[in-house]
Interface confidence: medium
């Protein structure tokens, strides 16, 4: 991967296909690396990240990490090569439509991550399919 | 290393009133929300209050509104409970406990050693 | 508010055995249950949050399962420490819900 903003253009010289043997493009993602979040007990945020970038490589896909210790939440939004390990973790999930967090064990430090492979998916993250719609406010001042 | 430390239990009168705190280590309390959580003796668990991690919202469990009143400072990294017309039902040890926020979870973690209130003439 | 209610409320067993606890909600709270553990006089320690996550520092014995109104608990070979009382309880809505306790006994 590469910042976002450095201008992207594509490697004409690695044509990549898909298992249909179509040219492969490469992905549009949401890329602002780490920003702080205000994401927090919810069914699903937005990225609030304003950068659309065309991934470097025709194989990258999408990824958001989300992270929250005692000072603060980060949301990270970048590429990356699903062949290869993101914070020390095989992306799983890439082939997903939808950027799903699944928990990872960090000490020190909730840490989800998701990937996934339609275009800007990882603007849309999303924690639980089903969640709580009763009294949410009440709960943040139980458990928040 | 988290420690929470209940005091202020003991003995009371019916219709008499007393004040838990709970001091707290070894994490940044203004980033949690907190609360009581009692048991009776020989009982199971029964949450009772909780106080938003800024102080700015409560929430109390039915039997004990207009009775209760939690509350915390961020400076002193001490919570606290008011207990007023305090009933032989309310007879327990109470906890405090640490609450934890995460999309798609919510728990209690970790407790103090808690402290034991008696309402009895 | 939502009721959870867990069996059996004792069981006696063996060092070795393979425990099991259920725990059933009056409606659905998802995946929103977590599972304690008490010994007397002392505080409840957090094992398993979100009904399949194990708490950092908990035995790999532990291990949760369930959705929706039913969850389960397993000590896959019970040890000497585990017996105490064991709790599950809703964070699905307020207010926050508890099991009546599952007391495990030595046979």
């Known amino acids: 991967t590469i910042p976002p903003h450095v201008q992207k253009s594509v490697n004409n010289d690695m044509i990549v296909t898909d298992n249909n043997g179509a040219v492969k493009f490469p992905q549009l993602c949401k890329f602002c690396d780490v920003r702080f979040s205000t994401c927090d007990n919810q069914k699903s945020c937005m990225s609030n990240c304003s950068i659309t970038s065309a991934c470097e490589k025709p194989q990258e896909v999408c990824v958001a990490v989300w992270r929250k210790n005692d000072e603060n939440i980060t949301l990270e939004t970048v590429c990356h090569d699903p062949k290869l390990p993101y914070h020390d973790f095989i992306l799983e999930d890439a082939a997903s439509p939808k950027c799903i967090m699944k928990e990872k064990k960090k000490p020190g430090e909730t840490f989800f991550m998701c990937s996934c492979s339609s275009d800007e998916c990882n603007d849309n993250i999303i924690f639980s399919e089903e969640y709580n719609t009763s009294n949410p406010d009440l709960l943040l001042v139980i458990f928040q | 290393q988290v420690q929470l430390v209940e005091s202020g239990g003991g003995l009371v009168q019916p219709g008499g009133s007393l004040r838990l705190s709970c001091a707290v280590s070894?994490?940044?309390?203004?980033?949690?929300?907190m609360s009581w959580v009692r048991q009776a003796p020989g009982k199971g668990l029964e949450w009772v209050s909780a106080?938003?991690?800024?102080?700015?919202?409560?929430h109390n469990t039915d039997s004990v509104k207009g009775r209760f009143s939690i509350s915390r400072d961020n400076s002193k990294n001490t919570l606290y409970l008011q207990m007023n017309s305090l009933r032989a039902e309310d007879t327990a040890v109470y906890f405090c406990?640490?609450?934890?926020?995460?999309?798609?979870?919510?728990?209690?973690?970790?407790w103090g050693q808690g402290t034991l209130v008696t309402v009895s003439s | 508010d939502i009721q959870m209610t867990q069996s059996p409320s004792s069981l006696s067993a063996s060092v070795g055995d393979r425990v099991t606890i259920t725990c059933r909600a009056s409606?659905?709270?998802?995946?929103?249950l977590n599972w304690y553990q008490q010994k007397p006089g002392k505080a409840p320690k957090l094992l398993i949050y979100?009904?399949?996550s194990l708490q950092s520092g908990v035995p790999s014995r532990f291990s949760g399962s369930g959705s929706g109104t039913d969850f389960t608990l397993t000590i896959s070979s019970l040890q000497p420490e585990d017996f105490a009382t064991y709790y599950c309880?809703?964070?699905?809505?307020?207010?926050?819900?508890f099991g009546q306790g599952t007391k495990v006994e030595i046979k």
């Open positions: 406990a640490k609450g934890i926020a995460a999309s798609g979870k919510n728990y209690f973690d970790p």
């Open positions: 070894g994490f940044t309390f203004r980033r949690y929300a």
């Open positions: 106080i938003s991690a800024s102080g700015d919202r409560t």
């Open positions: 409606q659905s709270i998802s995946s929103y």
């Open positions: 979100a009904a399949s």
């Open positions: 309880q809703q964070s699905y809505s307020t207010p926050p819900t």
